[in-house]
Structures are given as C-alpha cells and as structure tokens.
Interface confidence: medium
C-alpha cells in the first residue's frame, strides 16, 4: 500500500529513509538533456523474500540528442562528485541497511540520474529527521516517523523533533510557524486498527542510531 | 517529461471566481512532482509566485498578495491541479502558469516558492479582472 500524504515537515530539519521497505518504487529520472532509454523501466522496485531484497529493474538514461546509444549503469567518478554533500551535525555511517530484513539498500546511482531521487513510499515505511546545520535538536520523543495505515487512510506519525538555533533560547512548540503547514496532520492515536509493518524492527534498529544519519543530498 | 496544459482562464468582474485548471500528462506519476501557480501581469518581466502545493497535497503555500482568496488542491488520479481565485481583483489580472517541480524523497522542501526551482511549465492561460 502506497503512503499518499508527505512526511511531515519539520522546520529547519530534514529527514531520510535509511532503508526502503519492499514495494518502494523509485522514478528513473534523468538529468537535463537526457532521458530514459525507450525500452528502458520507468521505476526502480524493491522487491525480494524472506532472507534477500534488491531492487528490480534498471534505470539507464541516453543523450537527448542520441536515438540508440545507451548509457552505462555504473557512475563516472565525475558524476558522483556533482552531488552535494550535506553538512550535518556530527556525521556518522549510517547503520547497516542489509540487516535489516524485507528492505533494500539506498540504490548506486546510475550515469546521467537526475539530480534529485523521487520516491513512492509504502505503509510502514521509517525515515529519521535531523536538524540542517546551525541547528541543534531539542528532543520531545522519536525524531523519526512511520507511515502507518488508520481507518483505512496512510498517514505519518509525527516526530518530536524541534530544531533550534545555536544562539537562539529554546523554541517550542507552536512557536515557529513552518512556510508550509499541515494541513490537519493527526499526531495522536485512536482505538481503531492501526497496521505497522516491521515496526518493531525498525524501532530497533533506530535504538542504535544517533540523530545524525545524513551524509549525502539528492538535491 | 511532463506536459501541463492550463484551462479555465478567462474575463471577470472584481469580486468573481474563477478556477483554473492543470492537467498533466506523461510516463511519470503524478504524484512525483510538487506542483504550483505563477502569474506574470502585463508589463512585468518576472512570474509572480501565487502558490504551490505538495506532491500529495499535504502542504500549501501562498503568496502574501493572494492569501485568503485563493486555494490550490489537486488530484492525482485525474493528474489535476486546480486554481480557485474567490474574491477577485483587477491586480490579479495576468498570464497564469503551471509549473511543475520534482524533489527528493530523501532530502526536501516540501513546497518551492522560487521559479528557478521549477522543471516544468504550461503554456500560460489568461485571466482579466476588470473593475
């Protein structure tokens, strides 16, 4: 089941999955003056069994300007150096995605991908927040949140994530108004059915995880 | 790539409704792409931000000037972003653009208010609010 709503925004903070749950899909999108190969899969999918999960389908971009020619899969160095490099609070490795079961890695990238990665995320997916640099993390609770399946409808739990300025006093809640703002985001529970696939895996695994998992940006 | 396709524009009298829509079309879903509303008023060189909307519509965001008066919503299984501008004013008068924006599913900023930010764009559709 796809999660049709956004994770929620948290201001001055970004968030990032560490794993893909089976279902993920994951556009093959190019770069400018490229485009995906006519024969070529418009998503990625992460698929698998019970011990293996990988993603299916490849994604392969060609020049605009060429009819035939494909482009190899494998990156250029030259084309991983154009991405961006994040500054976050104390960076570290991210925990072993593998390790964790029905769930695929972070894809490589492939020659000439767009710059930015597009993904469809599926019921019981996690991602982790982290305050952009020159904030710090007041924390509330979990600075993660999992798209759960309630009343029939996908939503987002929300993390209790604040970030704050260096040199500012401490905010709280309801004091910083985001640029964009929920629109109606429940952040409490109910007594109907409420499905968290692997849930407690993932809870976990975020147990042995700092708040600062982020080292590259598609963006 | 996308193809947007405005329809909706027209002439109204100060204080009417109008609704604009965007219909895309191409290989991608529609849910990839966050989605917003320029306008570019006769004279003027820059497009105007009016608004834009999240890929799920979770998030909204307006420009100060329209505010209050006029609400972008879509619909992904019609692949739809709509426009509706209540309470018209003559200073709303101007080509109004769709335009189309990816973002990461790992990195993002939920809605772009910038046109730089924007990889795609319609053709444009009409509005006059006369007085």
């Known amino acids: 089941e796809l999660c049709d709503d956004d994770p929620p925004e948290i201001p001055h903070a970004t968030f990032k999955a560490m794993a893909y749950k089976e279902g993920t899909m994951l556009n093959c999108e190019c770069k400018r003056g490229f485009r995906r190969i006519k024969s070529g899969s418009l998503y990625m999918l992460c698929t698998g069994n019970s011990s293996h999960s990988s993603w299916d389908n490849q994604c392969q971009c060609t020049s605009s300007a060429t009819r035939n020619t494909t482009k190899q899969v494998t990156p250029q160095p030259e084309e991983q150096k154009e991405r961006k490099t994040t500054e976050m609070q104390s960076p570290m490795q991210p925990v072993d995605q593998a390790s964790l079961p029905g769930h695929c890695r972070e894809p490589p990238p492939w020659e000439n991908e767009a710059t930015e990665r597009i993904y469809h995320f599926v019921v019981g997916q996690m991602v982790y927040y982290q305050c952009v640099q020159g904030y710090r993390a007041l924390h509330r609770g979990p600075a993660e949140s999992v798209c759960k399946m309630t009343h029939g409808k996908t939503r987002w739990t929300q993390p209790q994530l604040i970030c704050t300025g260096e040199m500012e006093t401490s905010q709280f809640p309801g004091e910083e108004k985001p640029q964009a703002s929920p629109e109606g985001r429940p952040e409490s529970e109910t007594s109907c059915l409420v499905t968290t696939t692997d849930f407690q895996i993932q809870t976990e695994m975020a147990a042995t995880m700092e708040t600062s998992i982020f080292t590259t940006e598609y963006q | 790539e996308v193809q947007l396709v405005e329809s909706g524009g027209g002439s109204v009298q100060a204080g009417g409704s109008l609704r604009l829509s965007c219909e895309a079309s191409g290989p991608t879903l529609f849910s990839s792409y966050g989605m917003g509303w320029f306008r570019q008023a006769p004279g003027k060189k820059e497009r105007e931000f009016v608004g834009?909307?999240?890929?799920?519509?979770?998030?909204?965001s307006y420009a100060d000037p329209v505010k209050d008066r006029f609400t972008i919503s879509r619909d992904n299984a019609k692949s739809t972003v709509y426009l509706q501008m209540n309470n018209t004013k003559p200073e709303d008068t101007a080509v109004y653009y769709c335009a189309a924006y990816t973002y990461s599913g790992s990195f993002y900023s939920t809605v772009k208010t910038h046109h730089d930010e924007y990889h795609y764009w319609g053709q444009g559709t009409q509005v006059t609010v006369s007085s």
């Open positions: 834009a909307i999240s890929r799920y519509g979770t998030y909204t």
